[in-house]
Protein backbone atom coordinates (compact mmCIF):
# COMPACT_ATOMS: atom_id res chain seq x y z
CA UNK A 1 0.00 0.00 0.00
CA UNK A 2 1.19 3.41 -1.16
CA UNK A 3 -0.01 6.52 0.23
CA UNK A 4 0.87 9.30 -1.70
CA UNK A 5 0.44 13.02 -0.02
CA UNK A 6 -1.62 15.62 -2.86
CA UNK A 7 -0.74 19.09 -2.71
CA UNK A 8 -3.98 20.79 -1.54
CA UNK A 9 -2.99 24.47 -1.69
CA UNK A 10 -5.22 27.35 -0.54
CA UNK A 11 -5.58 29.77 -3.11
CA UNK A 12 -3.29 32.89 -2.37
CA UNK A 13 -3.80 34.75 -5.80
CA UNK A 14 -5.56 35.58 -8.23
CA UNK A 15 -6.65 33.06 -11.24
CA UNK A 16 -3.84 32.79 -12.87
CA UNK A 17 -3.94 33.30 -17.14
CA UNK A 18 -3.12 29.68 -17.96
CA UNK A 19 -0.70 29.57 -20.57
CA UNK A 20 -0.07 26.11 -21.58
CA UNK A 21 2.89 24.82 -19.02
CA UNK A 22 3.78 22.28 -21.56
CA UNK A 23 6.48 25.46 -23.25
CA UNK A 24 8.33 25.89 -19.99
CA UNK A 25 10.16 23.60 -18.25
CA UNK A 26 8.86 22.22 -14.89
CA UNK A 27 8.55 19.03 -12.98
CA UNK A 28 5.49 17.93 -11.18
CA UNK A 29 6.37 16.08 -8.21
CA UNK A 30 4.11 15.26 -4.80
CA UNK A 31 5.14 16.47 -1.61
CA UNK A 32 5.55 12.84 -0.27
CA UNK A 33 4.97 9.12 -0.80
CA UNK A 34 4.61 6.64 2.35
CA UNK A 35 5.19 3.08 2.10
CA UNK A 36 6.02 0.47 4.54
CA UNK A 37 9.21 -1.34 4.63
CA UNK A 38 9.89 -4.55 2.85
CA UNK A 39 7.16 -2.98 0.38
CA UNK A 40 7.99 -1.20 -2.94
CA UNK A 41 6.97 2.05 -3.58
CA UNK A 42 6.16 4.32 -6.74
CA UNK A 43 7.77 7.95 -7.06
CA UNK A 44 5.96 10.02 -9.21
CA UNK A 45 7.59 12.70 -11.29
CA UNK A 46 6.06 13.92 -14.60
CA UNK A 47 7.97 16.83 -16.62
CA UNK A 48 7.27 19.35 -19.18
CA UNK A 49 9.25 21.23 -21.67
CA UNK A 50 9.45 23.63 -24.12
CA UNK A 51 11.16 21.47 -27.31
CA UNK A 52 8.24 20.68 -28.99
CA UNK A 53 8.60 16.98 -30.91
CA UNK A 54 11.90 16.13 -28.60
CA UNK A 55 12.96 13.04 -29.88
CA UNK A 56 17.06 13.14 -29.34
CA UNK A 57 19.28 11.47 -26.66
CA UNK A 58 17.76 11.62 -23.30
CA UNK A 59 18.85 11.05 -19.87
CA UNK A 60 16.84 10.60 -16.98
CA UNK A 61 18.46 10.43 -13.40
CA UNK A 62 17.14 10.23 -9.84
CA UNK A 63 18.98 11.38 -6.97
CA UNK A 64 18.81 11.11 -3.10
CA UNK A 65 19.28 13.38 -0.35
CA UNK A 66 19.83 16.91 -2.25
CA UNK A 67 19.07 18.37 -5.38
CA UNK A 68 21.93 18.54 -8.17
CA UNK A 69 24.68 17.57 -5.82
CA UNK A 70 23.13 14.26 -4.10
CA UNK A 71 24.43 10.88 -5.35
CA UNK A 72 22.70 9.15 -8.03
CA UNK A 73 20.57 5.80 -7.29
CA UNK A 74 19.17 5.76 -10.59
CA UNK A 75 20.59 6.72 -14.32
CA UNK A 76 19.01 5.41 -17.80
CA UNK A 77 19.88 6.46 -21.40
CA UNK A 78 17.55 6.77 -24.25
CA UNK A 79 19.14 6.70 -27.98
CA UNK A 80 17.61 9.30 -30.00
CA UNK A 81 14.12 8.39 -30.98
CA UNK A 82 14.18 5.32 -28.85
CA UNK A 83 11.02 4.77 -26.32
CA UNK A 84 13.46 2.36 -24.52
CA UNK A 85 15.60 4.18 -21.32
CA UNK A 86 18.66 1.85 -20.99
CA UNK A 87 19.13 1.59 -17.31
CA UNK A 88 22.84 2.62 -16.94
CA UNK A 89 22.58 2.47 -12.89
CA UNK A 90 20.19 1.16 -10.43
CA UNK A 91 21.71 0.62 -6.77
CA UNK A 92 21.71 -2.41 -5.18
CA UNK A 93 19.24 -3.21 -8.27
CA UNK A 94 16.17 -2.10 -6.45
CA UNK A 95 15.54 0.88 -8.40
CA UNK A 96 13.36 0.57 -11.92
CA UNK A 97 12.03 3.21 -14.06
CA UNK A 98 8.15 3.17 -14.61
CA UNK A 99 7.53 5.85 -16.67
CA UNK A 100 8.33 6.55 -20.16
CA UNK A 101 10.54 9.41 -20.32
CA UNK A 102 9.10 10.23 -24.12
CA UNK A 103 6.35 10.14 -22.69
CA UNK A 104 7.04 13.34 -19.67
CA UNK A 105 7.24 10.50 -17.11
CA UNK A 106 10.28 9.98 -15.40
CA UNK A 107 8.28 7.38 -12.18
CA UNK A 108 10.46 5.81 -10.54
CA UNK A 109 9.84 2.03 -8.49
CA UNK A 110 11.42 1.43 -5.59
CA UNK A 111 11.78 -2.28 -4.75
CA UNK A 112 12.53 -4.04 -1.22
CA UNK A 113 12.07 -0.98 1.34
CA UNK A 114 14.34 -0.32 3.85
CA UNK A 115 14.62 2.14 6.45
CA UNK A 116 17.73 4.00 4.89
CA UNK A 117 15.59 4.67 2.16
CA UNK A 118 13.70 6.89 4.20
CA UNK A 119 14.86 10.91 2.41
CA UNK A 120 14.29 12.37 -0.32
CA UNK A 121 14.64 12.05 -4.22
CA UNK A 122 15.17 14.35 -6.90
CA UNK A 123 13.98 13.72 -10.31
CA UNK A 124 16.28 15.25 -13.05
CA UNK A 125 15.95 14.63 -16.86
CA UNK A 126 18.85 15.69 -19.20
CA UNK A 127 18.24 16.40 -23.49
CA UNK A 128 21.65 15.85 -25.32
CA UNK A 129 20.61 16.00 -29.15
CA UNK A 130 20.55 19.20 -31.11
CA UNK A 131 18.92 21.09 -27.87
CA UNK A 132 21.17 20.66 -24.50
CA UNK A 133 19.18 21.15 -22.04
CA UNK A 134 18.39 19.79 -18.30
CA UNK A 135 16.02 20.30 -15.57
CA UNK A 136 15.85 19.03 -12.15
CA UNK A 137 12.80 18.64 -9.55
CA UNK A 138 13.92 21.43 -6.50
CA UNK A 139 12.25 20.41 -3.54
CA UNK A 140 11.82 16.19 -4.68
CA UNK A 141 9.51 13.74 -3.08
CA UNK A 142 10.19 12.85 0.22
CA UNK A 143 9.67 9.15 0.69
CA UNK A 144 8.45 8.15 3.65
CA UNK A 145 9.37 4.17 4.87
CA UNK A 146 7.49 2.99 8.01
CA UNK A 147 8.35 -0.06 9.71
CA UNK A 148 7.36 -2.26 12.51
CA UNK A 149 9.64 -1.73 15.37
CA UNK A 150 12.90 -4.24 15.29
CA UNK A 151 14.83 -4.96 18.60
CA UNK A 152 18.89 -4.32 17.21
CA UNK A 153 20.39 -5.02 20.52
CA UNK A 154 20.03 -5.89 24.09
CA UNK A 155 22.61 -6.00 26.73
CA UNK A 156 23.72 -5.70 30.02
CA UNK A 157 26.99 -3.98 31.06
CA UNK A 158 28.94 -3.06 33.78
CA UNK A 159 28.52 -0.14 35.81
CA UNK A 160 30.19 1.77 38.85
CA UNK A 161 30.59 -0.44 42.33
CA UNK A 162 29.97 -3.75 41.07
CA UNK A 163 26.34 -2.77 39.82
CA UNK A 164 24.72 -3.52 36.23
CA UNK A 165 22.61 -1.69 33.64
CA UNK A 166 20.88 -3.18 30.87
CA UNK A 167 20.45 -1.73 27.28
CA UNK A 168 18.18 -2.07 24.50
CA UNK A 169 18.09 -0.41 21.25
CA UNK A 170 15.10 -0.49 18.70
CA UNK A 171 14.20 0.26 15.17
CA UNK A 172 11.09 1.92 13.67
CA UNK A 173 8.87 4.38 12.07
CA UNK A 174 7.12 5.53 14.01
CA UNK A 175 10.18 5.60 16.24
CA UNK A 176 9.19 3.08 18.73
CA UNK A 177 8.37 3.22 22.79
CA UNK A 178 10.27 1.32 24.58
CA UNK A 179 9.83 0.05 27.95
CA UNK A 180 11.60 -2.51 30.43
CA UNK A 181 10.00 -5.08 33.00
CA UNK A 182 11.22 -7.52 34.99
CA UNK A 183 12.12 -8.32 38.46
CA UNK A 184 10.66 -5.56 41.31
CA UNK A 185 10.79 -3.17 38.26
CA UNK A 186 6.66 -3.65 37.56
CA UNK A 187 6.32 -1.80 34.13
CA UNK A 188 9.39 0.84 33.47
CA UNK A 189 9.94 3.46 30.50
CA UNK A 190 13.75 3.70 31.70
CA UNK A 191 15.71 6.55 30.52
CA UNK A 192 14.72 6.39 26.87
CA UNK A 193 17.04 8.03 25.04
CA UNK A 194 16.37 10.12 21.79
CA UNK A 195 16.62 9.12 18.32
CA UNK A 196 20.58 9.77 17.90
CA UNK A 197 21.68 12.03 14.59
CA UNK A 198 22.11 10.48 12.04
CA UNK A 199 20.04 7.56 13.05
CA UNK A 200 16.54 8.73 13.27
CA UNK A 201 14.82 5.82 13.79
CA UNK A 202 17.24 4.10 16.38
CA UNK A 203 15.89 4.86 19.83
CA UNK A 204 17.52 3.53 22.93
CA UNK A 205 16.30 2.62 26.66
CA UNK A 206 18.47 2.42 29.30
CA UNK A 207 17.85 0.63 32.98
CA UNK A 208 19.97 1.88 34.82
CA UNK A 209 20.58 0.10 38.05
CA UNK A 210 19.33 -3.96 37.88
CA UNK A 211 18.85 -4.63 41.49
CA UNK A 212 17.34 -8.78 41.36
CA UNK A 213 18.54 -11.20 39.66
CA UNK A 214 16.39 -12.37 36.70
CA UNK A 215 14.70 -12.05 33.19
CA UNK A 216 14.76 -8.53 32.14
CA UNK A 217 12.10 -7.56 29.18
CA UNK A 218 12.70 -4.80 26.54
CA UNK A 219 9.42 -4.09 24.78
CA UNK A 220 9.34 -2.02 21.67
CA UNK A 221 6.07 -0.67 20.00
CA UNK A 222 4.50 1.74 17.49
CA UNK A 223 1.44 1.79 15.43
CA UNK A 224 2.56 -0.94 13.04
CA UNK A 225 3.42 -3.43 15.82
CA UNK A 226 5.78 -4.75 18.63
CA UNK A 227 8.68 -6.35 19.32
CA UNK A 228 10.22 -7.96 22.76
CA UNK A 229 13.68 -9.26 23.71
CA UNK A 230 14.62 -10.33 27.34
CA UNK A 231 18.30 -10.68 28.74
CA UNK A 232 18.98 -12.70 32.06
CA UNK A 233 20.91 -11.62 34.65
CA UNK A 234 22.56 -14.34 37.28
CA UNK A 235 25.08 -13.01 39.83
CA UNK A 236 27.72 -15.61 41.11
CA UNK A 237 29.75 -14.31 43.56
CA UNK A 238 32.98 -15.77 43.42
CA UNK A 239 36.16 -13.85 45.37
CA UNK A 240 36.44 -10.86 42.30
CA UNK A 241 32.94 -9.87 43.38
CA UNK A 242 29.43 -10.08 40.97
CA UNK A 243 29.45 -10.81 37.70
CA UNK A 244 27.14 -12.27 35.07
CA UNK B 1 9.14 33.63 12.60
CA UNK B 2 6.09 32.33 13.81
CA UNK B 3 3.30 31.61 11.47
CA UNK B 4 -0.01 31.47 11.80
CA UNK B 5 -3.68 31.22 9.67
CA UNK B 6 -2.46 28.22 7.58
CA UNK B 7 -1.71 24.36 7.42
CA UNK B 8 2.50 25.29 8.76
CA UNK B 9 3.88 21.91 8.03
CA UNK B 10 1.98 22.06 4.35
CA UNK B 11 4.70 25.08 3.04
CA UNK B 12 8.38 25.84 3.11
CA UNK B 13 9.98 28.81 5.14
CA UNK B 14 12.68 30.80 3.10
CA UNK B 15 14.37 33.04 4.54
CA UNK B 16 16.26 36.12 2.30
CA UNK B 17 19.10 38.98 3.52
CA UNK B 18 18.86 42.57 2.88
CA UNK B 19 21.80 45.13 3.44
CA UNK B 20 20.65 48.56 4.04
CA UNK B 21 20.07 50.13 1.01
CA UNK B 22 20.84 46.99 -1.20
CA UNK B 23 18.88 44.25 -2.95
CA UNK B 24 17.57 40.93 -1.64
CA UNK B 25 19.65 37.46 -1.47
CA UNK B 26 18.30 34.12 -0.42
CA UNK B 27 20.24 32.39 2.51
CA UNK B 28 17.90 28.74 2.34
CA UNK B 29 14.51 27.19 2.65
CA UNK B 30 13.09 24.38 4.94
CA UNK B 31 10.04 21.93 4.81
CA UNK B 32 8.41 22.18 8.27
CA UNK B 33 7.50 18.66 7.86
CA UNK B 34 10.35 17.23 8.01
CA UNK B 35 12.80 19.79 8.99
CA UNK B 36 14.76 18.91 5.71
CA UNK B 37 16.93 21.83 4.24
CA UNK B 38 18.09 24.04 1.11
CA UNK B 39 20.93 26.21 1.63
CA UNK B 40 22.30 28.69 -0.65
CA UNK B 41 26.20 27.83 -0.93
CA UNK B 42 26.85 30.99 0.29
CA UNK B 43 25.48 30.93 3.93
CA UNK B 44 26.17 27.48 4.48
CA UNK B 45 27.81 27.75 8.12
CA UNK B 46 26.92 31.42 8.36
CA UNK B 47 22.72 30.26 8.85
CA UNK B 48 21.30 27.80 10.11
CA UNK B 49 17.69 26.78 9.49
CA UNK B 50 14.99 24.53 12.06
CA UNK B 51 11.48 24.74 13.04
CA UNK B 52 9.67 24.03 16.18
CA UNK B 53 6.44 22.57 14.61
CA UNK B 54 4.55 23.22 18.37
CA UNK B 55 4.95 26.62 18.23
CA UNK B 56 5.11 26.88 14.46
CA UNK B 57 7.74 28.90 14.44
CA UNK B 58 10.90 29.23 11.87
CA UNK B 59 13.99 30.05 13.15
CA UNK B 60 17.04 31.40 11.48
CA UNK B 61 20.91 31.44 14.10
CA UNK B 62 23.61 33.49 12.13
CA UNK B 63 27.09 32.16 13.61
CA UNK B 64 30.28 34.18 13.63
CA UNK B 65 28.74 37.65 12.92
CA UNK B 66 30.61 40.26 11.09
CA UNK B 67 29.65 43.57 9.83
CA UNK B 68 28.51 41.89 6.81
CA UNK B 69 25.84 40.27 8.56
CA UNK B 70 24.54 43.48 9.70
CA UNK B 71 21.50 43.57 7.31
CA UNK B 72 17.17 42.86 7.51
CA UNK B 73 16.63 39.52 7.65
CA UNK B 74 13.11 38.23 6.07
CA UNK B 75 11.34 35.32 6.30
CA UNK B 76 8.80 34.34 3.02
CA UNK B 77 6.68 31.97 2.74
CA UNK B 78 6.43 29.74 -0.55
CA UNK B 79 2.92 29.71 -2.52
CA UNK B 80 3.04 26.18 -2.97
CA UNK B 81 5.58 23.29 -3.04
CA UNK B 82 4.22 19.87 -5.14
CA UNK B 83 5.86 21.10 -8.35
CA UNK B 84 7.34 24.53 -9.66
CA UNK B 85 4.58 24.69 -12.42
CA UNK B 86 2.30 25.80 -9.25
CA UNK B 87 5.08 27.62 -7.27
CA UNK B 88 4.03 31.07 -6.58
CA UNK B 89 6.97 32.69 -5.76
CA UNK B 90 6.85 34.40 -1.99
CA UNK B 91 3.78 35.15 -1.38
CA UNK B 92 3.49 35.87 2.39
CA UNK B 93 6.74 38.10 3.71
CA UNK B 94 7.60 39.03 7.57
CA UNK B 95 8.20 42.41 8.37
CA UNK B 96 11.76 42.07 8.92
CA UNK B 97 14.23 41.60 11.82
CA UNK B 98 16.89 44.34 11.62
CA UNK B 99 20.08 42.79 13.03
CA UNK B 100 23.16 45.49 13.65
CA UNK B 101 26.81 43.83 14.00
CA UNK B 102 28.82 46.15 16.36
CA UNK B 103 31.78 45.87 17.47
CA UNK C 1 24.52 30.55 -10.28
CA UNK C 2 22.24 32.12 -12.37
CA UNK C 3 22.79 35.90 -12.30
CA UNK C 4 20.05 38.20 -12.99
CA UNK C 5 20.56 41.53 -14.59
CA UNK C 6 17.83 44.22 -14.28
CA UNK C 7 17.61 47.53 -16.31
CA UNK C 8 17.71 50.21 -15.73
CA UNK C 9 18.75 50.16 -12.12
CA UNK C 10 17.46 53.69 -11.45
CA UNK C 11 14.53 55.53 -13.51
CA UNK C 12 11.48 57.71 -13.57
CA UNK C 13 8.90 58.24 -15.10
CA UNK C 14 5.66 61.12 -15.17
CA UNK C 15 2.19 59.91 -14.65
CA UNK C 16 0.74 58.32 -17.20
CA UNK C 17 3.87 57.06 -18.98
CA UNK C 18 4.57 53.16 -19.93
CA UNK C 19 6.99 52.08 -18.50
CA UNK C 20 8.95 48.75 -18.76
CA UNK C 21 11.71 47.27 -16.66
CA UNK C 22 13.93 43.94 -18.13
CA UNK C 23 15.32 41.52 -16.29
CA UNK C 24 17.60 39.35 -17.91
CA UNK C 25 18.78 36.15 -16.66
CA UNK C 26 22.88 34.79 -17.67
CA UNK C 27 20.69 31.51 -18.45
CA UNK C 28 17.31 30.28 -19.27
CA UNK C 29 14.75 29.90 -16.39
CA UNK C 30 10.63 28.49 -16.74
CA UNK C 31 9.15 31.31 -15.17
CA UNK C 32 10.07 34.44 -13.43
CA UNK C 33 8.75 36.62 -10.18
CA UNK C 34 8.34 39.78 -9.44
CA UNK C 35 8.83 41.91 -6.20
CA UNK C 36 7.58 45.96 -5.37
CA UNK C 37 9.49 46.90 -2.23
CA UNK C 38 9.14 50.58 -0.63
CA UNK C 39 11.38 52.35 1.82
CA UNK C 40 10.61 51.02 5.11
CA UNK C 41 8.40 47.30 4.38
CA UNK C 42 8.84 43.86 3.28
CA UNK C 43 8.80 42.99 -0.39
CA UNK C 44 5.09 42.49 -1.53
CA UNK C 45 4.47 39.47 -4.57
CA UNK C 46 4.12 41.50 -7.34
CA UNK C 47 3.70 38.92 -10.49
CA UNK C 48 3.75 35.20 -9.98
CA UNK C 49 4.83 32.67 -13.25
CA UNK C 50 5.95 35.08 -15.48
CA UNK C 51 2.22 36.65 -16.37
CA UNK C 52 -0.02 36.76 -13.12
CA UNK C 53 -0.61 39.42 -11.14
CA UNK C 54 -0.88 39.01 -7.65
CA UNK C 55 -4.07 39.68 -5.28
CA UNK C 56 -4.40 43.04 -5.37
CA UNK C 57 -2.10 44.16 -8.03
CA UNK C 58 -3.44 46.53 -10.31
CA UNK C 59 -4.35 45.98 -13.98
CA UNK C 60 -2.37 48.70 -15.23
CA UNK C 61 0.86 46.11 -14.44
CA UNK C 62 1.55 43.26 -16.79
CA UNK C 63 4.66 40.78 -16.99
CA UNK C 64 5.98 38.98 -20.40
CA UNK C 65 9.09 37.14 -21.30
CA UNK C 66 10.74 33.50 -22.06
CA UNK C 67 13.84 31.77 -22.00
CA UNK C 68 16.24 34.40 -20.53
CA UNK C 69 14.56 37.23 -21.03
CA UNK C 70 11.61 38.65 -19.30
CA UNK C 71 10.05 42.16 -18.28
CA UNK C 72 7.71 44.13 -15.84
CA UNK C 73 5.47 46.98 -17.87
CA UNK C 74 3.28 49.60 -16.00
CA UNK C 75 0.38 50.57 -18.70
CA UNK C 76 0.42 54.24 -17.64
CA UNK C 77 2.31 55.04 -14.73
CA UNK C 78 0.59 56.55 -11.25
CA UNK C 79 2.35 57.92 -8.36
CA UNK C 80 1.60 54.91 -5.79
CA UNK C 81 4.16 52.64 -8.72
CA UNK C 82 7.24 54.71 -7.25
CA UNK C 83 9.20 51.80 -5.76
CA UNK C 84 11.76 49.37 -6.08
CA UNK C 85 11.64 46.42 -8.29
CA UNK C 86 13.02 43.09 -8.01
CA UNK C 87 12.58 39.99 -10.89
CA UNK C 88 13.57 36.58 -9.05
CA UNK C 89 14.05 33.12 -10.89
CA UNK C 90 13.41 29.69 -9.37
CA UNK C 91 14.59 27.32 -12.00
CA UNK C 92 17.61 26.34 -10.43
CA UNK C 93 19.73 26.80 -7.42
CA UNK C 94 20.42 29.02 -5.71
CA UNK C 95 17.24 30.72 -5.88
CA UNK C 96 18.69 34.58 -7.05
CA UNK C 97 16.85 37.61 -7.25
CA UNK C 98 17.99 40.97 -9.67
CA UNK C 99 19.54 43.65 -8.24
CA UNK C 100 16.34 45.79 -8.22
CA UNK C 101 15.13 48.59 -10.15
CA UNK C 102 14.27 52.01 -8.30
CA UNK C 103 11.14 53.37 -9.97
CA UNK C 104 10.18 57.45 -9.22
CA UNK C 105 8.00 59.51 -10.11
CA UNK C 106 9.04 62.77 -12.53
Known amino acids: FVRTKIDTTENLLNTEVHSSPAQRWSMQVPPEVSAEAGDAAVLPCTFTHPHRHYDGPLTAIWRAGEPYAGPQVFRCAAARGSELCQTALSLHGRFRLLGNPRRNDLSLRVERLALADDRRYFCRVEFAGDVHDRYESRHGVRLHVTAAPRIVNISVLPSPAHAFRALCTAEGEPPPALAWSGPALGNSLAAVRSPREGHGHLVTAELPALTHDGRYTCTAANSLGRSEASVYLFRFHGASGAST | CKAS????????MDWVKQRPGQGLEWIGE????????NYNQKFKGKATLTVDKFSRTAYMELSSLTSEDSAVYYC?????????????????WGQGTLVTVSA | ENVLTQSPAIMSASPGEKVTISCSAS?????MYWYQQKPGSSPKPWIY???NLASGVPARFSGSGSGTSYSLTISSMEAEDAATYYC?????????FGAGTKLELK
Open chain 3, 27 to 31: SSVSY
Open chain 2, 5 to 12: GYTFTRYW
Open chain 2, 30 to 37: IDPSDSYT
Open chain 3, 49 to 51: RTS
Open chain 2, 76 to 92: ARSGAYSSDYSYDGFAY
Open chain 3, 88 to 96: QQWSSNPLT
